[in-house]
């Protein structure tokens, strides 16, 4: 594929990445799949400025990001190292709370109304943010 040099229509560019902000809600897995079909991934937050950029665009609304611990340890969907990377959890989070009565704990991370992160039940229909890097090769065939 060709290298993407500008963001698709309705996506927002920031620091060599493109972001798309949903206005509807989906379960985490459906949101993850949506982004993959767009040749992107759920947003991976790697810095304070990226955190603030996303926060600025989503407002005080619960919104999925590309972080989960469904297979044990916390993992970013693009392979970014969780342990050494940026984190912005709310105090006392993540807590893998079982008291919600929906079965299981809480395995998916989202931005809360103040921008800080919480783990929640992956089936909750939250908004989501897709991200794709401008410099990566696009899956679209090059224009002739």
């Amino acid at each position: 594929g060709s290298e993407r040099t500008c963001c698709p229509v309705n996506w927002v560019e920031h620091e060599r990445s493109c972001y798309w902000f949903s206005r509807s809600g989906k379960a985490w897995a459906d949101a993850d799949n949506y982004c993959r079909l767009e040749d992107a991934h759920l947003v991976v937050v790697t810095s304070w400025e990226e955190q603030k950029f996303v926060q600025h665009h989503i407002g005080p609304v619960n919104t999925w990001m590309g972080l989960h611990d469904q297979n044990g340890p916390w993992k970013w969907v693009d392979g970014t190292d969780y342990e050494t990377g940026f984190k912005n959890w709310r105090p006392e989070q993540p807590d893998d709370w079982y008291g919600h009565g929906l079965g299981g704990g809480e395995d998916c991370a989202h931005f809360t109304d103040d921008g800080r992160w919480n783990d929640d039940v992956c089936q909750r229909p939250y908004r989501w943010v897709c991200e794709t890097e401008l410099d990566k090769a696009s899956q679209e065939p090059p224009l002739l």
């Epitope: 810095s47 304070w48 926060q55 600025h56 959890w89 103040d114 921008g115």
Partner: antibody, heavy 123, light 107 residues
Amino acid sequence: QVQLVESGGGVVQPGRSLRLSCAASGFTFSSFIMHWVRQAPGRGLEWVAVIWYDGSNKYYADSVKGRFTISRDNSKNTLYLEMNSLRVEDTAVYYCAREEYSSGWFGYGMDVWGQGTTVTVSS
Amino acid sequence: DIQMTQSPSSLSASVGDRVTITCRASQGIRNDLGWYQLKPGKAPKRLIYAASSLQSGVPSRFSGSGSGPEFTLTISSLQPEDFATYYCLQHYSFPFTFGPGTKVDIK
């Protein structure tokens, strides 16, 4: 009222260590990002380090990286700056400051500062 | 790292004067900029946050404007207690950086 009080400053020889403390009161310390900032004699303000509310992120100015360590004890409402391998150029007034949390929103910079504690590095 | 330049480095003014201080960032910082007042032996005091919002308790003669790389602090009518050194601070990304300061003294 919201208050930050620094302590631990003093005169120290180059190469030695010192630990500064910042006692917080009047707010929920564990919910706030905290900073250290310094001002050398006759110079401007210089940001030194920051620590997240839970200690999960720490960032440092290049001038102190590898020598200074920022930490906190939320049970004691206290912020620390461990300063090792001190240099003459570390001589300054050291301030602790709170990152604003306003209307459930972060990212407005430092809103509350302490009065500062003086560190003098001299042989 | 983001560099902050500030002008003028010092100025002499009289009570009642209108004073303008400019700060410029080496790259875009959105509106992640604050203005601080520093007096000897006292804690720094924030005057303006988010480039143009007045800190609670700060007199309305202080105002901030600008976005992107260039920002301005204006004191509409200088008062005796305003003689101090003023710093801008970018808190867009780490390391945070201050401008070199502007000393405002009595003419």
